[in-house]
Interface confidence: low
């Protein structure tokens, strides 16, 4: 339905508080280097303008699109050229090209300082002194570091952030109350950002059809009692929501997400029996809860799939009449019967089915040709099952840190050209699959593990896309969204790689390592491990383990020494020499 003023429409729908928060997120996700104060000024100007449009929708400029209004505002930033370089050229373009240009300049790895958490008392004072600014700063800092963060979900995180400070700054032991909550929000936030990044990559790199296929599979697993028509409606609406958010249309996205939550709750009887508690919550919690809701129970006595999709004489007729609808029905029926499969596996099966029909429906005897199509699924199902079994056994044997190290070595040998920080970050995250998924029973392991790995490998893909260094990574990332994990799994040691020159500086450590947290110390050691493999890609597991054990002992010894710095200097030289000898460097 058309509105005279889009900005007035969204302001009224969302309310001033959410409107301001979402505009701040949008601006911070576009201009990631701008100071906080500049963004707040821009947001206030937009908000004041929106209020004039609410008062009179016919007022000057109120009929302009949100992209035009926001783009014009961003292009008033004085330092655009010196801060952002060629992004300033976007401002010479007209909409919609200007917005597309801004989107293309979003940086997944912006050169921003690490967020350092102040002392609890300092944070509580800041919170009480100016709560509004404190919470805006949170939105700004997260949004600029995560330019694809799902905006309505970030409002939910901010609400929990506020609640944590509200409760804990009054507690007897503020730190004991607050720090675990902040750690949880940080970890959940990183996971949420990465999941949304995959959705945006799916839409932007592989198109709406790929996203819709993913959504059909996931929603059919989650809502197996819902009719195909109901699932299709939800998929259409969900696709619109994510297309908007990934496209920077955050006000529309948040508004449409609220409408979708409302629709789901009004129609929960025909969607899922698991929605009741979610639907009793306030809006932000409700939307989050629905997105995370457990799978409903499968209907009893579902008929065999073969009847409609293999044995029926109408398979090719039904396929020809509406290919995507028929394939959507296949995916829906398969997914609702298989909550134990990963979404990417279900999509591989649907792709195999599609390829078979494309070939067989043109053959002399189509039925004879596709009669054994389900037999082709067996190896596709067994491959991830076996891989997960092997890796969970390895995880249980090694524990998370050493399992991460095994993956670090594995992936550095596969793609040694990738930067060390990226290899460390991605391999650490890949390694977390163990503690996240291996504890689950067999029926939940695959959806947990393989869909999580898709999210992590997408991080590798988006970071690599910024600075491409490996044809193998490019190939695995761009050929097929659903086959990314099997593609990386299949990579062997890169025999074309020329080992890196040995540089003693890379393996020189100082006393500051002793004051680092356990996590940061692990990252230091894992960085050294990647560098070792880059110098000696043919080193055996045993050789690397010996060197890493020596390294751990060296750090422990020098951190206990009276003169730590001297110890690191002298013992470090000995360690480098011993390692060179052990690895033949």
């Amino acid at each position: 339905d058309a509105h005279k003023s889009e900005v007035a429409h969204r302001f009224k729908d969302l309310g001033e508080e959410n409107f301001k928060a979402l505009v701040l997120i949008a601006f911070a996700q576009y201009l990631q280097q701008c100071p906080f104060e500049d963004h707040v000024k821009l947001v206030n100007e937009v908000t004041e303008f929106a209020k004039t449009c609410v008062a009179d929708e016919s007022a000057e400029n109120c009929d302009k699109s949100l992209h035009t209004l926001f783009g014009d505002k961003l292009c008033t930033v004085a330092t655009l050229r010196e801060t952002y370089g060629e992004m300033a050229d976007c401002c010479a373009k007209q909409e919609p090209e200007r917005n597309e240009c801004f989107l293309q300049h979003k940086d997944d790895n912006p050169n921003l300082p690490r967020l350092v958490r102040p002392e609890v008392d300092v944070m509580c004072t800041a919170f009480h002194d100016n709560e509004e600014t404190f919470l805006k700063k949170y939105l700004y800092e997260i949004a600029r570091r995560h330019p694809y963060f799902y905006a309505p979900e970030l409002l939910f995180f901010a609400k929990r952030y506020k609640a944590a400070f509200t409760e804990c700054c009054q507690a007897a032991d503020k730190a004991a109350c607050l720090l675990p909550k902040l750690d949880e929000l940080r970890d959940e936030g990183k996971a949420s950002s990465a999941k949304q990044r995959l959705k945006c990559a799916s839409l932007q790199k592989f198109g709406e059809r790929a996203f819709k296929a993913w959504a059909v599979a996931r929603l059919s697993q989650r809502f197996p009692k819902a009719e195909f028509a109901e699932v299709s409606k939800l998929v259409t609406d969900l696709t619109k929501v994510h297309t908007e958010c990934c496209h920077g249309d955050l006000l529309e996205c948040a508004d449409d997400r609220a409408d979708l939550a409302k629709y789901i709750c009004e129609n929960q009887d025909s969607i899922s029996s698991k929605l009741k508690e979610c639907c009793e919550k306030p809006l932000l919690e409700k939307s989050h809860c629905i997105a995370e809701v457990e799978n409903d129970e499968m209907p009893a006595d579902l008929p065999s799939l073969a009847a409609d999709f293999v044995e029926s004489k109408d398979v090719c007729k039904n396929y020809a009449e509406a290919k995507d609808v028929f394939l959507g029905m296949f995916l829906y029926e398969y997914a609702r019967r298989h909550p134990d499969y990963s979404v990417v596996l279900l999509l591989r099966l649907a792709k195999t089915y599609e390829t078979t029909l494309e070939k067989c429906c043109a053959a002399a005897d189509p039925h004879e040709c596709y009669a054994k199509v389900f037999d082709e699924f067996k190896p596709l199902v067994e491959e991830p099952q076996n891989l997960i079994k092997q890796n969970c056994e390895l995880f249980e044997q090694l524990g998370e840190y050493k399992f991460q190290n095994a993956l670090l070595v594995r992936y550095t040998k596969k793609v040694p050209q990738v930067s060390t920080p990226t290899l460390v970050e991605v391999s650490r995250n890949l390694g977390k699959v163990g503690s996240k998924c291996c504890k689950h029973p067999e029926a939940k392991r695959m959806p947990c593990a393989e869909d999580y790995l898709s999210v992590v490998l997408n991080q590798l893909c988006v970071l690599h896309e910024k600075t491409p260094v490996s044809d193998r990574v490019t190939k695995c990332c761009t050929e097929s969204l659903v086959n990314r994990r099997p593609c990386f799994s299949a990579l062997e040691v890169d025999e074309t790689y020329v080992p890196k020159e040995f540089n003693a500086e890379t393996f020189t450590f100082h006393a500051d390592i002793c004051t680092l947290s356990e996590k940061e110390r692990q990252i230091k050691k894992q960085t050294a491990l990647v560098e070792l493999v880059k110098h000696k890609p043919k080193a055996t597991k045993e050789q690397l383990k010996a060197v890493m054990d020596d390294f751990a002992a060296f750090v422990e010894k020098c951190c206990k020494a009276d003169d730590k710095e001297t110890c690191f200097a002298e013992e470090g030289k000995k360690l480098v020499a011993a390692s060179q000898a052990a690895l033949g460097l």
Partner: nanobody, 123 residues
Framework: QVQLQESGGGLVQPGGSLRLSCAAS????????IGWFRQAPGKEREGVSC????????NYADSVKGRFTISRDNAKNTVYLQMNKLKPEDTAVYYC????????????????WGQGTQVTVSS
């Protein structure tokens, strides 16, 4: 530990009025939605009214609309329930409860509860 204390209950004749207070100690009510609930003997606890942390949003059970008014005084760290035109069926123990920021639609959505105050409407 967060504490809520109700007061203002008592015996009143039908058609009379009472004003219940819910005072918080050891924490500030500014960031909490406060709900009033009641429980009559042998019945489940039911929502009566709620006011959001901002004070801008209030809601009432159908049975008390037009008779009860909820308000808050953040300076006094207290929320009030003004009850007019009381009826015998309003007889119950009245409880106040707090939830961060927004009203909840279910009893279990509230984090902190008071001990309750008895209201008896009888001639």
């Amino acid at each position: 530990q967060v504490q809520l204390q109700e007061s203002g209950g008592g015996l009143v004749q039908p058609g009379g009025s009472l004003r219940l207070s819910c005072a918080a100690s050891r924490f500030t009510l500014d960031y909490y939605a406060i709900g009033w609930f009641r429980q009559a003997p042998g019945k489940e606890r039911e929502g009566v009214s709620c006011i959001a942390s901002s004070g801008g949003s209030t809601n009432y059970a159908d049975s008390v609309k037009g008779r009860f008014t909820i308000s808050r005084d953040n300076a006094k760290n207290t929320v009030y329930l003004q009850m007019n035109k009381l009826k015998p069926e309003d007889t119950a123990v009245y409880y106040c409860a707090a939830a961060v920021l927004e009203c909840r639609t279910v009893v279990r959505g509230y984090d902190y509860w008071g001990q309750g105050t008895q209201v008896t409407v009888s001639s």
